[in-house]
């Protein structure tokens, strides 16, 4: 009767850190002679396992107990598998050499075990500084470590699956693998409250995808607007100047008030305003004396935002003519307020 | 240093019992089958009974077949013999063997004598 | 009766080789190892497998097999050496462990 090695599993799946059974049994108990195990096969083909004693196995053992002189069980289970165990599995046996070494007589049709590894919760970074509204700007989201190699990644922003992403796999063993995906996103005044999403799909994680978030609040400036207005003229014959600094974000914020050049008084603002869409307001009143002054003063709200080069606002205060019951000013607003970008 | 140190024995008259222990240590029992074998005096050896590593598999040769049990106890790492209906002819050196991989001997204990007599 | 069948005595001068055969077991289904028994003293497995040596044998024991027959090869014999040899087998249709009669090794001189 021919032997027959018989391995019934064409491929075994487990996950990482599991335990995998590999079975082989023989249909005969002769010819005499070892039953051993290889991964892979031909010229670089690598011993695994030999049911011939004297070697160590750590991870290896036995299923059945080979040492009942009737075992046709071949078996051999693999614990705490990793990547790098995935592989074909080969169940040989051996005859007894006369004077030659053993040779090899008959093999099993082998076992593919695959290693079922998670990808590691994507990690989600943005660009290094703030950009404006209206740049566009790079997410990048990375996963680590997972097999096998099929794996579906996807970006929404605000629920929204994003397109406009270049996604690279990549391996340096061929065991597991790693995943980058970066995606480009324009920006708009409205994203402060938007946050992008990496999903990441794969079989291991049951149809449970694994989220990576990155939010705009963290990547986004908008850059104030400056205003000011002046209330009437008090029976104190002061100037009360008003600087209102509309829809800004993040909150860092300098605000100084210049007499003709020359700074008066420097705000750091504590309190704000917060608006619906995220951004905030911040008002600055400024007190002027108009008998301190005899000629036209021009007053300039300054303002220095996340670091960003200063912004300004003008505000011309004239003067009338000095009577005998005592000087008074008039004001005039200087309409064309420019931005200082330089 | 595989150490195997047999003890039980003495003088039994024919059809009496007889209980063989066999402490082992200096490898790990449990995985190694084991095996009995005995010697007459000014005969050659005999193999007389085997057992699997696990315990569940035993063999004998048709001389001992339905009269000798060999068992173990792994927690113990202890192998036994339990000898009954004994014969003259049982009468001998019983050394208790660990097997190889392929159930040849590597390590044999110092002995134990067995005398049937009445 | 013993099932393997080796010569009951053999001499050999110290320094010379001595070779021991056991035959009578089926080659597709039988290991063989030798045991060498001073008397007195317990049995020391010399080969094992057919021709492994256990590592506290000195090389000079070897063993080799060719068809049903397997020889040990006792190379540079010493004095010490003069023992009762054991074939040993593992019949694997049987499960059984049959053994030779043992040969007497004289050492001569």
């Known amino acids: 009767k021919e032997l027959k090695v018989t391995q019934a599993d064409k491929s075994v799946s487990v996950a990482a850190g599991d335990s995998a059974t590999l079975n082989c049994t023989v249909s005969s108990l002769t010819p005499v002679g070892p039953i051993k195990w290889f991964k892979g096969e031909g010229q670089n083909r690598s011993p695994i396992y030999s049911f011939i004693g004297g070697e160590h196995f750590p991870r290896i053992t036995n299923v059945s107990d080979a040492t009942k002189r009737n075992n046709m069980d071949f078996s051999i289970c693999i614990s705490n598998v990793t990547p790098e165990d995935a592989g074909t599995y080969y169940c040989v046996k051996f005859q007894k050499g006369i004077v030659e070494p053993d040779t090899e007589i008959k093999s099993g049709g082998g076992t593919t075990l695959y290693v079922l590894a998670k990808p590691s919760s994507p990690e989600v970074s943005g660009p290094d500084s703030r950009g404006s509204p209206g740049q566009t700007v790079n997410f990048t989201c990375k996963s680590y470590g997972f097999s096998p190699r099929n794996i579906t990644l996807k970006w929404l922003k605000d629920g929204k699956e994003l397109s406009h992403l270049e996604t690279t796999i990549s391996s340096k063993s061929n065991v597991s693998y790693n995943i980058s995906s970066t995606v480009s996103v324009k920006l708009s005044p409205e994203d402060i409250h938007s946050r992008v999403i990496c999903e990441v799909a794969h079989v291991t994680l049951e149809g449970r995808p694994l989220n990576g978030t990155a939010n705009f609040s963290n990547i986004i400036r908008v850059s104030p607007t400056l205003k000011i207005t002046q209330q009437p003229l008090t029976p104190a014959s002061q100037v009360n100047l008003t600087c209102q600094v509309q829809k800004f974000y993040p909150k860092a914020l300098q605000l100084n008030w210049l007499e003709n050049g020359n700074l008066s008084r420097t705000d750091k603002p504590e309190h704000f305003t917060d608006n619906r869409d995220g951004t905030y307001n911040y008002t600055s009143l400024f007190l002027v004396n108009s008998s301190a002054h005899r000629e036209d003063v021009v007053f300039t709200c300054q303002v220095e935002h996340d670091s960003q080069p200063a912004i300004t606002e003008n505000h011309t205060v004239r003067a009338f003519a000095h009577s005998s019951s005592g000087g008074s000013m008039e004001t005039i607003p200087d309409n064309n307020a420019y931005y200082n970008w330089n | 240093e595989v150490q195997l140190v047999e003890s039980g024995g003495g003088v039994v008259q024919p059809g009496g019992s007889l209980r063989l222990s066999c402490a082992a240590s200096?490898?790990?029992?449990?995985?190694?089958?084991m095996s009995w074998v005995r010697q007459a005096p000014g005969k050659g050896l005999e193999w007389v009974a085997g057992?699997?590593?696990?315990?569940?598999?035993?063999y004998y040769p048709a001389s001992v077949k339905g009269r000798f049990t060999i068992s173990r106890d792994n927690s113990k790492n202890t192998l036994y013999l339990q000898m009954n209906s004994l014969r003259a002819e049982d009468t001998a050196v019983y050394y208790c063997?660990?097997?190889?991989?392929?159930?040849?001997?590597?390590?044999w204990g110092q002995g134990t004598l067995v005398t049937v007599s009445s | 009766s013993y099932e393997l069948t080796q010569p009951p005595s053999v001499s050999v001068s110290p320094g010379q080789t001595a070779r021991i055969t056991c035959s009578g077991g089926?080659?597709?289904?039988?290991?063989y190892a030798w045991y060498q028994q001073k008397p007195g003293q317990a049995p020391v497995t010399l080969i094992y497998?057919?021709?492994k040596r256990p590592s506290n044998i000195p090389e000079r024991f070897s063993g080799s097999s060719s068809g049903t027959t397997v020889t040990l090869t006792i190379s540079g014999v010493q004095a010490e050496d003069e023992a009762d040899y054991y074939c040993?087998?593992?019949?694997?249709?049987?499960?059984?462990?049959?053994f030779g009669g043992g040969t007497k090794l004289t050492v001569l001189g």
């Open positions: 200096g490898f790990t029992f449990s995985s190694n089958a």
């Open positions: 057992i699997s590593a696990g315990g569940s598999d035993t």
């Open positions: 063997a660990r097997e190889t991989w392929n159930h040849l001997f590597d390590y």
């Open positions: 089926s080659y597709s289904s039988y290991y």
């Open positions: 497998s057919d021709d």
């Open positions: 040993g087998g593992y019949d694997q249709s049987s499960y059984t462990n049959p």
